[in-house]
Interface confidence: low
């Protein structure tokens, strides 16, 4: 006869570990008892339980309520036991010794491996701003046994670097994702993917990238010369920019206060029926938490009664 067992039994932390020990013998052979022991390199062999064909299961008090036989129906040649609620301290070598009649005794050893599934955490890096060099976007840390694998899933171009810290019964892996911030990365997902044999499927944590930027400002509205004549209505100047966070707009006149009747509505400056008083240098000031930009234009309102005068349009930033 021979013992059927496993070299390695793998179980997830908190689950029940089945320690297999099945005697494969001739039909007339019987199993009298199965002795289970923990084999510790320092403490030697420590009895776990004794499974007797006649007297049933006797468990070492140290393992009371933790060692059981598998649920029925049971094969009389099956000396397997269940170790309930496996913890990391249970990891190690176990031995089953089977006494049979008339073939004698057999023994086998196996290693119990307790997988500790990781609970990953993702930490965003410092605020990202366009114009920075290679910057930490996020770091992801997972600790488990054995060491988990930590990778990144994203369409964003960047670099990944990992480091491990080994503890007595586990290992922590931290992976960092660095990138050169660009406004095109705004709203893009950056996903930390943690793989581990104790997980049924990869754990994923997603961080949405936010990159602060402010585009150059420019002013539109002076393209049609006919609009900028005395008496014309509906003349507007519009300040063009974009940013993250969204920018605020402010309009001023360089050579004095805004004329009466000129309305500021966010990025747009609206004029009442034009007079020569509306000629001047207008400045659009765009700002957000990151930066500020200015664009200025010179408006000259043409008086049709003065045919010698042309509309002079100058735009400068």
């Amino acid at each position: 006869g021979e013992l059927e067992t496993s070299d390695v039994v793998t179980v997830v932390l908190g689950q029940d570990a089945k320690l297999p020990c099945f005697y494969r013998g001739d039909p007339d052979e019987q199993v009298g008892q199965v002795a289970w022991a923990r084999v510790d390199p320092n403490e030697g062999i420590r009895e776990l339980a004794l499974l007797h064909s006649k007297y049933g299961l006797h468990v070492n008090p140290a393992y009371e309520d933790r060692v059981e036989q598998p649920p029925p129906p049971r094969d009389p040649l099956d000396g397997s036991v269940l170790l309930r609620n496996a913890v990391q301290a249970d990891e190690g070598e176990y031995e089953c010794r089977v006494s049979t009649f008339p073939a004698g005794s057999f023994q086998a050893r196996m290693r119990l491996r307790v997988l500790v599934p990781p609970l990953p955490s993702l930490n965003p890096g410092p605020p990202l701003e366009e114009g920075q060099g290679l910057t930490l976007a996020a770091s992801c840390t997972a600790e488990g046994s054995p060491a988990p694998s930590v990778t990144w899933d994203t369409e964003v171009k960047g670099t990944q670097s990992s480091r491990s810290f080994t503890h007595p019964r586990s290992a922590a892996v931290t992976s960092e994702f660095h990138l050169v911030p660009s406004r095109s990365m705004n709203g893009q997902p950056l996903t930390c993917v943690v793989s581990h044999p104790g997980l049924l499927q990869d754990r994923r944590i997603t961080h949405t990238l936010q990159v602060a930027f402010l585009a150059e400002a420019s002013v539109r509205g002076l393209e049609d010369q006919n609009l900028w004549q005395v008496g014309r209505e509906g003349a507007t100047l519009k300040c063009l920019s974009e940013g993250q966070p969204p920018p605020k707009y402010n309009w001023t006149r360089l050579d004095g206060p805004l004329p009466s009747g000129v309305r500021v509505k966010g990025d747009t400056l609206g004029f009442p029926p034009l007079t020569t008083e509306h000629s001047g240098v207008y400045v659009c000031h765009v700002s957000n938490e990151l930066s500020s930009r200015d664009s200025q234009v010179t408006v000259e309102v043409l008086d049709p009664e003065d045919p010698g005068k042309q509309v002079d349009l100058v735009s400068a930033s």
Epitope: P70, D75, S195, P197
Partner: antibody, heavy 116, light 107 residues
Framework: QVQLQQSGPELVKPGASVRISCKAS????????IHWVKQRPGQGLEWIGW????????KYTENFKDKATLTADKSSSTAYMQLSSLTSEDSAVYFC?????????WGQGTTLTVSS | SIVMTQTPKFLLVSAGDRVTITCKAS??????VAWYQQKPGQSPKLLIY???NRDTGVPDRFTGSGFGTDFTFTISSVQAEDLAVYFC?????????FGGGTKLEIK
């Protein structure tokens, strides 16, 4: 997403050997077992064995101990099964599958025909 | 090795019918049983693991139950796309063994 891409169909002569490949992608190759399963035309499924790429441990069912050899190449995330001394009984579709215990992702299968 | 006896071998049903397939293990396999679906010309697909847990994305008309030696797989309301062969498998101890399969055909 997880994918197992197997090599194409094989036509070999009796007595020869063949090596079938299974390239894994979409997960960490070294943290899951790769199992191999045989299916003869119109028949059921027969487990051959597994390899754990993390430490290259292997386990075979008794019928395949002298027939199949399982290997893995971590650098290319590819598992291989070599079948030797082929006979017509080895003509079948062979699948690789990922799993810890049950098999959650399968390759598309490789058809092996042994014929003179 | 553990023998998984699966019944019936064939099932001819109409769309909307309830279907039950059973698998009996030759010795206790705890709840370490999986069920797979294999459509014509395709590789098997995991439906149920640990006897009663549906895999990700598997419709809830597929259910499994059982413990020890007797296991049941049910399709509560068969759809046309369920035409396939269904296999049980024990992953309690090596060698992992499969049932002989049940071929489901739609009238």
């Amino acid at each position: 997403q997880v994918q197992l891409q197997q090599s194409g169909p094989e036509l070999v002569k009796p007595g020869a050997s063949v090596r079938i490949s299974c390239k894994a992608s979409g997960y960490t190759f070294t943290t899951y077992y790769i199992h191999w399963v045989k299916q003869r035309p119109g028949q059921g499924l027969e487990w051959i064995g597994w390899i754990y790429p993390g430490n290259v441990n292997t386990k075979y069912t008794e019928n395949f101990k002298d027939k199949a050899t399982l290997t893995a190449d971590k650098s290319s995330s590819t598992a291989y099964m070599q079948l030797s001394s082929l006979t017509s009984e080895d003509s079948a579709v062979y699948f690789c599958a990922r799993g810890l215990y049950y098999f959650d992702f399968w390759g598309q299968g490789t058809t092996l025909t042994v014929s003179s | 090795s553990i023998v998984m006896t699966q019944t019936p071998k064939f099932l001819l049903v109409s769309a909307g019918d309830r279907v039950t397939i059973t698998c009996k293990a030759s010795q206790s396999v705890n709840n370490d049983v999986a069920w797979y679906q294999q459509k014509p010309g395709q590789s098997p697909k995991l439906l149920i693991y640990y006897a009663s847990n549906r895999d990700t994305g598997v419709p809830d008309r597929f259910t499994g139950s059982g413990f020890g030696t007797d296991f049941t797989f049910t399709i509560s309301s068969v759809q046309a796309e369920d035409l396939a062969v269904y296999f049980c498998q024990q992953d309690y101890s090596s060698p992992y063994t499969f049932g002989g399969g049940t071929k489901l055909e739609i009238k």
